[in-house]
């Protein structure tokens, strides 16, 4: 239904608190360099305006679109060109081009300092003084660093944050209460960010059809008892929600997500038997819970997939009559039977099936041609299964840090031109897949591993797009989203790479490394490891292990020494010499 005032409609639907939070997220994701205070001022102005429209929908400007209202606010910011350069040119355009222009200027890797968590006492003091401002800062800091973060989900994480602070700030030992809990939220939020970025990439690069296919596969796995019509309705709604969020329409996105959650809870009987616990929760928790609800029990009497999609003489006729519906049905039927497959794998199988029908249905005897299609799926299924086994075995043998290092060596060899910080970030993230997925039951490993790796590799592609340096990476990133992970896995040592010359200063360390937190120490060591591989791309695992063990021993010795500075300055050059010899 059309509303006289869109802004009044959204304010009424969402309520003041969520409305303000979403507007703050929107502004922070568009203008990532502005301070919290600048954005908070704009949010208050927009909220006051929304209230006037609620009071009188016919008031001046209340009929304007949200893009027009928000865009006008952003374009009125003083010193826009000085702070944002060519983004200011967006303000010369009319809607909808202006909003598209803002979207194109979102920076996936903004040059902002890492978000440092204040110490417990300070955090609790400012939280108690003004919880609203404190949470506003959280939304602002996360949103500007993650310009595609799923806005309604960020409100959920802010709510989690709030609950943790409320609980822990009342404890005697605030630090030990806060640290593990906030670390848990941070980890989940970071994973949520890369997953959502992948969805937006899918939408931006391949359109709604590609995202809808992803949604059909995912929903069919989770709700195997829902019929195809129900899955299609949910996938269509979910596509709309994600399109809105990826497009910066955060108020509509959050509103439609709430509607979708409501619909699911009102129609549990035709969707899944597992929704009740989620549906008993308040809005943000409910929507979050539904998004990661456990798979329903698969129907016991499902016929073999071959009956309708291989053995039936009508396959090509059905395909001709409604290609997308027939392929959608195939994806639905295959996915509901395979909660143990990754969505990426299911989409590759559907693509293979489509290609087979395209080829076979044009032949004089199609059934003879497509009759072997399911057998042709086998190598596509085996490849990720082997990947999971090999990598989980390696993780179990080396632990997370050692596994990250193995991945770092592998990926530096595949794409040595990529900057060391990007390689280290990617390897650390890829390496976390072990901790995240390899401990799960066998039937959950493959979907966890592959879909997580795909999301991380999407980030690698986004960073590489800004400054393309590796033909290997460009090749894998320019293909379809579902083929990226197999493409990266298949890459070998880049033979075109001219090794970096050995620079002693790259491997020179000082006593300040001793006081760094463990994570920062690991990053320093991993930076050195990547640089070693860039110097000697064909170094054996044994050679690299020797050097890294020597390096670890050197750090341990010097950090325990009475005179650390002297130890570093005398033993450091010896270490460099030994490294050069070991790799000669």
């Amino acid at each position: 239904e059309a509303h006289k005032s869109e802004i009044a409609h959204r304010y009424n639907d969402l309520g003041e608190q969520h409305f303000k939070g979403l507007v703050l997220i929107a502004f922070s994701q568009y203008l990532q360099k502005c301070s919290y205070d600048e954005h908070a001022k704009l949010v208050q102005e927009v909220t006051d305006f929304a209230k006037t429209c609620v009071a009188d929908e016919s008031a001046a400007n209340c009929d304007k679109s949200l893009h027009t209202l928000f865009g006008d606010k952003l374009c009125a910011i003083p010193n826009l060109r000085e702070n944002y350069g060519e983004l200011a040119d967006c303000c010369t355009k009319q809607e909808p081009e202006r909003n598209e222009c803002f979207l194109q200027h979102k920076d996936d890797n903004p040059s902002l300092p890492p978000f440092e968590r204040p110490e417990a006492e300070a955090m609790c003091t400012s939280f108690k003084e003004n919880p609203t401002t404190f949470m506003g800062h959280y939304l602002h800091e996360v949103a500007r660093r993650h310009p595609y973060f799923y806005a309604p989900e960020l409100l959920y994480y802010a709510e989690q944050y709030n609950e943790i602070l409320t609980q822990c700030c009342a404890e005697a030992d605030k630090e030990s209460c806060l640290t593990p809990k906030l670390d848990g939220v941070k980890e989940k939020a970071l994973v949520s960010s890369v997953r959502q970025r992948m969805k937006c990439s899918s939408m931006q690069k391949f359109g709604e059809r590609a995202f809808k296919a992803w949604a059909v596969a995912r929903l069919s796995q989770t709700f195997p008892n829902a019929d195809f019509a129900e899955i299609t309705k949910l996938a269509t709604d979910l596509t709309k929600v994600n399109k809105e969020c990826c497009h910066g329409d955060l108020l509509e996105c959050a509103d439609d997500r709430a509607e979708l959650a409501k619909y699911m809870c009102e129609n549990q009987a035709t969707i899944s038997s597992k929704l009740q616990t989620c549906c008993d929760k308040p809005l943000l928790k409910k929507a979050h819970c539904l998004s990661e609800v456990e798979h329903d029990t698969m129907p016991a009497d499902l016929p073999a997939i071959a009956a309708d999609f291989v053995e039936d003489q009508e396959v090509c006729k059905n395909y001709a009559e409604a290609k997308d519906v027939f392929l959608g049905t195939f994806l639905y039927e295959y996915s509901r039977r395979h909660p143990d497959y990754s969505v990426s794998l299911l989409l590759r199988l559907a693509k293979k099936y489509e290609a087979t029908l395209e080829k076979c249905c044009a032949e004089a005897n199609p059934p003879a041609c497509y009759g072997t299609v399911l057998a042709e799926f086998q190598p596509l299924v085996e490849e990720p299964k082997n990947l999971v086994k090999t990598n989980c075995d390696l993780y179990e043998k080396l632990g997370e840090y050692g596994f990250q290092n193995a991945i770092l060596v592998r990926y530096t060899q595949k794409a040595p031109q990529v900057s060391t910080p990007t390689l280290v970030e990617a390897a650390r993230n890829l390496g976390r897949v072990g901790t995240k997925c390899c401990t799960l039951p066998e039937d959950q490993r493959l979907p966890c591993v592959e879909d997580y790796l795909s999301a991380i590799l999407n980030r690698v592609c986004l960073l590489h797009e800004k400054t393309p340096v590796s033909e290997h990476v460009t090749k894998c990133c320019s293909g379809s989203l579902v083929e990226r992970r197999p493409c990266f896995s298949a890459l070998t040592v880049d033979e075109t790479y001219v090794p970096k010359e050995f620079k002693a200063e790259t491997f020179t360390f000082h006593s300040d490394i001793c006081t760094l937190p463990e994570k920062e120490k690991q990053i320093k060591k991993q930076t050195a490891l990547a640089e070693l591989v860039k110097h000697k791309p064909k170094a054996t695992a044994e050679q690299l292990k020797t050097v890294m063990d020597d390096f670890a021993q050197f750090l341990d010795t010097c950090c325990k020494a009475a005179d650390k500075d002297t130890c570093f300055s005398t033993e450091g050059p010896n270490l460099v010499t030994r490294c050069k010899d070991a790799l000669a």
Epitope: Q313, K317, C361, A364
Partner: nanobody, 115 residues
Framework: KVQLVESGGGLVQPGGSLRLSCAAS????????MTWVRQAPGKGLEWVSS????????LYADSVRGRFTISRDNSKNTLYLQMNSLRPEDTAVYYC????????SSQGTLVTVSS
């Protein structure tokens, strides 16, 4: 909406000829192999002939090989069946179908071979 409309049937004497046509719409005709099937009075469906999307490959049932010729004109979205040396046992309703389908969804065209 996929539509297949057969025409060209009629009464013909044994040894005579007929040319059946099938006008197709609602799908990418050239991307699909096509088939002629027939159903004699009181009998089940019988496959007659098939042709690939490009028209380069053709297949025939033993009972019609050497007498019937399947062809297509992709520019006109039309399938043909040239039937020569017709016999009384060729009497049937003839249907065109998509791919290897043996269950028609069209009206068909009646061919009667009788003296």
């Amino acid at each position: 909406k996929v539509q297949l409309v057969e025409s060209g049937g009629g009464l013909v004497q044994p040894g005579g000829s007929l040319r059946l046509s099938c006008a197709a719409s609602g799908f990418t005709f050239s991307s699909f192999g096509m088939t002629w099937v027939r159903q004699a009075p009181g009998k089940g469906l019988e496959w007659v002939s098939s042709i690939s999307g490009s028209g380069s490959d053709t297949l025939y049932a033993d009972s019609v090989r050497g007498r019937f010729t399947i062809s297509r004109d992709n520019s006109k979205n039309t399938l043909y069946l040239q039937m020569n040396s017709l016999r009384p046992e060729d009497t049937a309703v003839y249907y065109c179908t998509i791919g290897g389908s043996l269950s028609p969804s069209s009206q068909g065209t009646l061919v009667t071979v009788s003296s």
